[in-house]
């Protein structure tokens, strides 16, 4: 019962987590910026992995997608890749875990198969969660190290002067959604792995039978006979371990499983 509950809860937690990872990946608010140098109206800029948006206090909002792939910062591409890998692994994990659920019967699937599937999905959820956490953390680090406060450096460029706009870059809501979602997926994966241990059938204690030679060094002789060691009589030259059922006349006897020790 506890195993079923752990597995079921792990599945639900992972499902919520993966839904969160998808939501975070699609959200526009990964980075938010207040543009200070505008004397007209408050301008709020926010960016996601796929597009950038400008919102003004007047109500005007416009978003534009990053249509190019080659020109974008490598770090953005890396974050995109991590999030997509996380979603794909999570989706496959969910699919596998549905069939692995103890409460769902599919044909005559054994518990050992369900245990393996539960472990597989658990590992997938853990990797998925780690990918999401890594992706969000890489983006957050990019904001902290490069953009936290762009100073107004002025320099001359072609066509006149250029200056960086003094903006304050802050963490967007998507980062927090991503962190929480990644954590939930990770926790769900761990729960699935724990459930797997309970699902795995108990190891069968097979009775091991050991056979021992009667003498010190039993030499094998052609014809299926064994030579005496000199300790003990064995004068009738009977086959050892054969219960004395056959004599030397039964030369063409087939070797039994006891003949080779």
């Amino acid at each position: 019962m506890a195993v079923t509950a752990c597995q079921g809860l792990g599945f639900v937690v992972s499902l919520i987590g993966i839904a969160g990872i998808i939501a975070a990946t699609c959200m526009d608010q990964w980075s938010t910026q207040d543009l200070y140098n505008n004397p007209v109206t408050a301008v709020f800029n926010y960016q996601g992995l796929w597009r950038s948006c400008v919102r003004e206090s007047s109500g005007f909002t416009e978003c534009r997608g990053y249509f190019t792939l080659l020109g974008l910062p490598a770090m953005l591409q890396a974050v995109r890749a991590l999030m997509i890998v996380g979603i794909v692994l999570g989706a496959i994990g969910l699919l596998v875990s549905i069939f692995a659920l103890k409460c769902i019967r599919i044909g005559s699937m054994e518990d050992s198969a369900k245990a393996n599937m539960t472990l597989t999905s658990g590992i997938m959820f853990i990797v998925s969660g780690l990918c999401a956490i890594a992706g969000v953390s890489v983006f957050a680090n990019m904001l902290v190290t490069n953009f936290w406060m762009s100073t107004a450096n002025m320099y001359t460029g072609m066509g006149g002067m250029v200056q960086t706009v003094q903006t304050r870059y802050t963490f967007g809501a998507a980062l927090f959604v991503g962190w929480v979602a990644g954590g939930l997926t990770l926790i769900g994966g761990v729960m699935m792995c724990i459930a797997c241990r309970g699902l795995a059938p108990e190891e069968t204690n097979y009775k091991a039978v050991s056979y021992h030679a009667s003498g010190h060094s039993v030499a094998y002789k052609p014809g299926g006979f064994k030579a005496s060691t000199g300790f003990g009589s064995n004068t009738k030259n009977k086959k050892i371990y054969d219960g004395g059922a056959r004599t030397e006349d039964e030369v063409q006897s087939y070797p039994s499983k006891h003949d080779y020790v």
Epitope: L35, F60, G157, Q163
Partner: nanobody, 122 residues
């Protein structure tokens, strides 16, 4: 590389009109606010007018009611319609634009043009 090129300046009589244009070109991702700043001979920079991407405009008190700023987002072009010009409007007019580049859509820059000279004299 981004370039802002002003045009439309020249000599005009007091009370006359001029229309300045500023065309932005290059690897621009998104232009936010655009504006005009002027520098009269021997004086410092004076802010004239600014317009956001959404069309919200603001003017310096000295030009209110006489100048009109507008923009065409699809062409990345800024305009300044100057009416009832006075001698004190004589200056080099610079256009500037807050924008980000295709290669770095997470960072905002203000680019400035080389300027166009407007002379108001009889």
């Amino acid at each position: 590389q981004v370039q802002l090129v002003e045009s439309g300046g020249g000599l005009v009589q007091p009370g006359g009109s001029l229309r300045l244009s500023c065309a932005a070109s290059g690897s621009i991702f998104l232009i936010n606010a655009m504006g005009w700043v002027r520098q009269a001979p021997g004086k410092g920079l004076e802010w004239v007018a600014v317009i956001t991407r959404g069309g919200s405009a603001n003017y310096a008190d000295s030009v209110k009611g006489r100048f009109t700023i507008s923009r065409d987002n699809s062409k990345n072009t800024l305009y300044l319609q100057m009416n009832s010009l006075r001698a004190e409007d004589t200056a080099v007019y610079y256009c500037n634009a807050d924008l980000n580049l295709r290669s770095d859509p997470f960072k905002w820059y203000t680019f400035w043009g080389q300027g166009t000279l407007v002379t108001v004299s009889s």
